[in-house]
């Protein structure tokens, strides 16, 4: 069979081969597509309810004023010429509409390096076949699952036009100390071949890298967090981050219900004091980050130094914060 | 909402003529093929024409061919049927109908009007 | 030209059965057949499209098969409002024909 590609909505003509060019002609068209259920036999002295989709043409060829996603199938004639010789036509046709050029949308205009990031969506529609969205970065294609870039993709079909709408949603993390303005784009390749790819225009949004966090100190007072009881215990939590962030106060790994505080001031200190401290800073910009975990601990008379793996009671006794 | 509405029915006179209308809205009028259907009283629905969309081909049964001629005039949404040569048995309440091929075939119809052909 | 065998002309049938009406169509029209509903005095209007599609707004309770050349229309519990008359139409060929109609009626 002969194969025929064809643009939706617009007029084709399909040749009877061997057909006389005027009437009479012994001629007959069958039809096998989306509109049929096994043949559908068209004949020049036809007219009805099919001239809609395809009707004969004087001279025999068969005029499609329309083709549609249902057109796609099989097209024979058959037709016998004044001597009687038979030929027989036989097409194959296929239909496709190229669809608007893709956008990107919900597009980024900043990246945070190092972690994933949206970058956007590409959206194509009206397509048949459905075809296939693909991403660039600085004009090479992007390959999903490969260094830290992820691809989400939806296709959809409109119920009436049958016709479909692509999206893409790109995910990228940016490597630290790379492009600080990656180019971005999407194109959509068509399914039927010898169809050039339709590209959306570009986009650059910023890379912004994150400066690297100074660790948070914590500071006790005395050094070595060993006292004598009721004694008094100063914990000072130093964060070098501008603005400051806020400070919050854990004791063996839970939050202490404190109003946020760089100081913490354990008075009169005794048994229920005990314990694990640290304190945790929270940026606006990078979540929280922990100090070391310092250890409180009662001498009793006697004893020398801090004790190693001293238990904590449960009670915080009277807390300042500074 | 598609509406169609049917007009010019009523009494004439054996071997007269009578000229129906049908004003269409509520959809892009000259996307449709058009079609006429009739029902005589007490009697069943019968096919009396059709029209393709840009109104260059036409289709009737042998029952009303030579004497009914269909049209349109898609700039004002609207579809017409010329009876010439009316019969008693033309006697019938006349519906226009959207579409009449194959892709969309008497999806929505109008009221009908009544045509009496009597001496 | 087709011709559209319709059976049976008329039924009756209570509240609640189950209703099947049958056209025959005497050559291949493939799917290309739809049934309407009419009621007295008013226009008719469609069910069901190219042979087992129903038609917006149609409930639930209708619907249409084929075989071969054989077209059902069934209703699997009859509501008081679907008592009307009821019609085939095949549309693969000129001239449309109708069947000659289903009076469903009140037992």
């Known amino acids: 069979a002969q194969n025929i590609t064809a643009r939706i909505g617009e007029p084709l003509v399909l040749k009877c081969k061997g057909a006389p060019k005027k009437p009479p002609q012994r001629l007959e068209w069958k039809l096998n597509t989306g509109r049929t259920e096994a043949w559908k036999v068209l004949s020049p002295q036809g007219g009805g309810p099919w001239d809609s989709v395809a009707r004969v043409l004087p001279n025999g060829s068969l005029f499609l004023p329309a083709v549609g996603i249902q057109d796609e199938g099989i097209f024979r004639c058959q037709a016998m010429n004044r001597n009687g010789k038979e030929t027989k036509s036989n097409y194959r046709v296929r239909v496709y509409q190229i669809p608007g050029k893709p956008e990107i949308v919900d597009s980024a205009s900043e990246l945070t390096a190092g972690v994933p990031n949206k970058v956007g969506t590409c959206v194509s529609e009206g397509s048949y076949p459905a075809g296939t969205l693909s991403w660039h970065l600085d004009g090479k294609p992007l390959v999903p699952n490969e260094k830290g870039v992820s691809v989400k993709e939806q296709t959809r079909r409109h119920p009436e036009t049958g016709l479909f709408t692509l999206q893409s949603e790109l995910m990228v993390t940016p490597a630290r100390g790379g492009d600080p303005r990656p180019t971005f784009s999407c194109s959509f390749s068509p399914g039927l071949p010898r169809h050039r790819a339709l590209r959306t225009a570009p986009i650059q949004p910023r890379v912004w890298e994150p400066v690297p966090l100074e660790e948070v100190q914590l500071v006790v007072e005395p050094e070595g967090g060993a006292v004598a009881p009721g004694g008094t215990v100063t914990l000072t939590c130093e964060v070098p981050a501008q603005p400051s962030p806020q400070i919050h106060w854990m004791k063996d790994g839970v939050p202490l219900p404190l109003p946020p505080s760089p100081v913490l001031i354990l008075p009169e200190i005794g048994p229920q004091d005990q314990g694990t401290y640290s304190c945790v800073a929270t940026h606006s910009s990078h979540g929280p980050q922990e100090s070391r975990a310092v250890s409180i601990s009662i001498i009793e008379p006697g004893e020398e130094g801090p004790t190693a793996g001293s238990v904590g009671g449960s009670g915080l006794g009277t807390l300042a914060l500074a | 909402e598609v509406q169609l509405v049917e007009s010019g029915g009523g009494l004439v006179q054996p071997g007269g003529s009578l000229r129906l209308s049908c004003a269409a809205s509520?959809?892009?009028?000259?996307?449709?093929?058009m079609t006429w259907v009739r029902q005589a009283p007490g009697k069943g629905l019968e096919w009396v024409a059709s029209?393709?969309?840009?109104?260059?081909?036409?289709y009737y049964p042998d029952s009303v061919k030579d004497r009914f001629t269909i049209s349109r005039d898609n700039a004002k949404n609207s579809l017409y049927l010329q009876m010439n040569s009316l019969r008693a048995e033309d006697t019938a309440v006349y519906y226009c109908?959207?579409?009449?091929?194959?892709?969309?075939?008497?999806?929505?119809w109008g009221q009908g009007t009544l045509v009496t052909v009597s001496s | 030209d087709i011709q559209m065998t319709q059976s049976p002309s008329s039924l009756s049938a209570s509240v609640g059965d189950r209703v099947t009406i049958t056209c025959r169509a005497s050559q291949d029209v493939g799917i290309y057949v739809n049934w309407f509903q009419q009621k007295p005095g008013k226009a008719p209007r469609r069910l069901i499209y190219r042979a087992t599609n129903l038609a917006d707004g149609v409930p639930s309770r209708f619907s249409g098969s084929r075989s071969g050349t054989d077209f059902t229309l069934t209703i699997s519990s009859l509501q008081p409002e679907d008592f009307a008359t009821y019609y085939c139409l095949e549309f693969d060929e000129h001239p449309l024909t109708f069947g000659g109609g289903t009076k469903v009626e009140i037992k």
């Open positions: 029209i393709d969309n840009s109104g260059d081909n036409t």
């Open positions: 109908a959207r579409g009449g091929d194959i892709r969309v075939s008497l999806d929505h």
């Open positions: 509520g959809f892009t009028f000259n996307n449709y093929w």
